[in-house]
Interface confidence: low
Amino acid sequence: SDKLYQRKEPVISSVHTKVKGIAEVTENVTEGGVTKLGHSIFDTADYTFPLQGNSFFVMTNYVKSEGQVQTLCPEYPRRGAQCSSDRRCKKGWMDPQSKGIQTGRCVPYDKTRKTCEVSAWCPTEEEKEAPRPALLRSAENFTVLIKNNIHFPGHNYTTRNILPTMNGSCTFHKTWDPQCSIFRLGDIFQEAGENFTEVAVQGGIMGIEIYWDCNLDSWSHHCRPRYSFRRLDDKNTDESFVPGYNFRYAKYYKENNVEKRTLIKAFGIRFDILVFGTGGKF
């Protein structure tokens, strides 16, 4: 209940997260025209990325474009990108949808299609579908430790969500262990009424809300967090209009003294930690 005699002030907060878990990924790898099953292990350094602010990202799926080198090559023949003569290709033109700068030549992409030649990282990225099921679907079993320090400067009061008595092997449960600050990613989705396996394919944004409703009066002191979970991205967005959450990054290497890269389109879950609440004192 609202204590009108108290002086209230909003919480000031800092958050630090640590994700743990190992994923085993099996995918089709094509080498020299032969497709075989590739097997790899992903650890924290492979699937998490440092983000600004109170967020962390866990990669759940990806599409790779391997062995790219800076040179000239035909543009990927997405719809509207095909040509039949050089007239269709404008030297120096940078189409926002394109992956490079046009040279002005119309060249064969394959036996049946021609596209404008571009100066780019080649071969240019193909418009591949995100694998289903997601390659890192086992990320559902990863855990995240959330450290949340809070401060009410006006009341000169500081505390944190992790208590000295907490067991490092606990897992958050809204009934059995509501104060544990280690969360299983699959449980977060379940609490939010979402299907992790489904969201993992295209990615999404999940909110972890930490609510502090603190009574700082010595005679009825209470200041513990309450956790809740909510999906933040628009899951009803038409699939043809940039669904989910993804970004691209590259791994660079040298082969025979030529700089190459593997481009990775990473799909995954961005977790936003939203801390709010007030501290009240007479």
Epitope: E126, E129, V201, Q202
Partner: nanobody
Framework: EMQLVESGGGLVQAGGSLRLSCAAS????????MGWFRQTPGKEREFVAA????????YYADSVKGRFTISRDNAKNTVTLEMNSLKPEDTAVYYC??????????????????????WGQGTQVTVSS
């Protein structure tokens, strides 16, 4: 309106091969995802293989992986299903299907009947033991 005509079905011994072909009427064939489904009497139509509009991605049912190969020729408006090491359980009517590519990452949907707009009449494949 696009039309599809299958051919290449027939009777074959177990362990043998067949090549099914599906010809599409001229038009924007390259804008369509193409798939093969099959149906046996009293059972639902089941997904066999599919190729995306861009010919970049191919998808196969687990039961045919490594034995069947789907390919398309956008210049000739055809999609073929190369079937090797045939088994008696492959006996069915095989249907060719076309689904217009509407954008987005629709790969997984290529295994669903509802993703296809146009269907052929079907061709019978019988594998004897």
């Amino acid at each position: 309106e696009m039309q599809l005509v299958e051919s290449g079905g027939g009777l074959v011994q177990a362990g043998g091969s067949l090549r099914l072909s599906c010809a599409a009427s001229p038009g924007t064939f390259s804008s369509f995802n193409m798939g093969w489904f099959r149906q046996t009497p009293g059972k639902e139509r089941e997904f066999v293989a599919a190729t995306s509009w861009s010919d970049i991605s191919t998808y196969y049912a687990d039961s045919v992986k490594g034995r069947f190969t789907i390919s398309r020729d956008n210049a000739k408006n055809t999609v073929t299903l190369e079937m090797n090491s045939l088994k008696p359980e492959d006996t069915a009517v095989y249907y060719c299907a076309a689904g217009y590519y509407r954008g987005g990452y629709l790969g997984y949907r290529l295994t669903l009947e509802g993703s296809y707009d146009v269907w052929g009449q079907g061709t019978q494949v019988t594998v004897s033991s």
